[in-house]
Amino acid sequence: PLATIPVSTTSLTSSEGSTISTPSVDISTPVTTSIVGDQCSRCKNGGFWDGLKCQCLTPYYGESCEEVVNSIDIAPPETVSAQMELTVTVTSVKFTDELKNHSSQEFREFNKTFTEQMNIVYSGIPEYVGVNITNLRLGSVVVEHDVLLRTKYTPEYKTALDNATEVVKQKITKVTTEQIMTNDNCSALMCFNTTGTQVQNITVTQYDPVEECRQKAEEYEDYFLVEYRDQKPYCISPCESGFNASKNCNHGKCQMSQNGARCLCVTTETHWYSGEDCNQGTQKSHHHHHH
């Protein structure tokens, strides 16, 4: 239980002339106190005490979570993908009601042939993963399906996937123009109605390392930026060394503040250092002591 402590107040005047009130405890009263959350006040910037140390929130670190990290982990996905919703009309198979049932033998056979056909059509596209039929309907067989594309994440992934979707469009247009019925017969694996080919929608994975970096940097978002090394994005402040944006503090230490990166200059036995980049050295004057 927390004890109630009688307190009297003593007033002092600071050198600036303002009045400071300081509590003074009446020690005549025996006190039992339970230190509740005392360590929590040690942990700044939203950090919390785990019983041993402060657990800091990004982008803070240090004994009391008072310092700002120089770099923040951002993890782009290993692979990124695109999904194209397409419709083609197959004329070499006649529609039957069983095709609507995805567990029927008819659907399984159609799915097998259609998948084989599309694997042939898209065989030259390295990003191609496969096709997935979403719906079959009358006319002969109108095939609503997804074409799935995937590639390794690089800064240019959107361009790679955009290019792949263009090649998909070209290839499906070509095959549905060339593989058509002659006298109600199809000599190809599948035949199509040229006019039934449509691209309904294209969805591409959205990943923006700059956005992730800014979000994780929170109130320091204006001072953290993304730089690439070996195609991998790094979320760094100017205090992180080894990047184009790195701040050179010469004879000093880089420290982040809410106004950005600044250099804290050092003083050596022989010099004082100053200036924005701690590059201005002033030699200390030597005083000779005579006895």
């Epitope: 039957t96 008819e106 056979e109 159609f110 694996l189 599948m190």
Partner: nanobody, 123 residues
């Protein structure tokens, strides 16, 4: 699952006749597509005669007027009546089926196959 068993092949003189049979097991005989394909030595498998449950039939130009495809639903059997046989009809004949109502001559679109029966036309 459809299983097919072809029979009726043999050696016949030019101008002779043969009747091939293909017995099907499974409950799918009344629907889908059925057909006969053949493969001569060193050549690709080709469609000879095909039939679908909606009435579509196909005959290769080289057999038109000589071969007839038919089926007996009560016996779950497919037939190929071959008349006026020629030396160029020599091949292994395969029966094929699909539960789909097909219009394709491409063997890769047909999912179920019987083992072949050899037809040799020689004097």
């Amino acid at each position: 699952e459809v299983q097919l068993q072809a029979s009726g092949g043999g050696v016949v003189q030019p101008g002779g006749s043969l009747r091939l049979s293909c017995a099907a097991s499974g409950d799918t005989f009344s629907r889908g597509s059925w057909g006969w394909f053949r493969q001569a030595p060193g050549k690709e498998r080709e469609a000879v005669a095909l039939i679908s449950s909606d009435g579509w039939t196909f005959y290769a130009d080289s057999v038109k007027g000589r071969f007839t495809i038919s089926q007996d639903n009560s016996k779950n059997t497919l037939y190929l009546q071959m008349n006026s046989l020629r030396a160029e009809d020599t091949a292994v004949y395969y029966c094929a089926a699909s539960v789909l109502v097909l219009r394709t001559l491409n063997p890769k679109a047909w999912h179920h196959w019987g083992q072949g029966t050899m037809v040799t036309v020689s004097s």
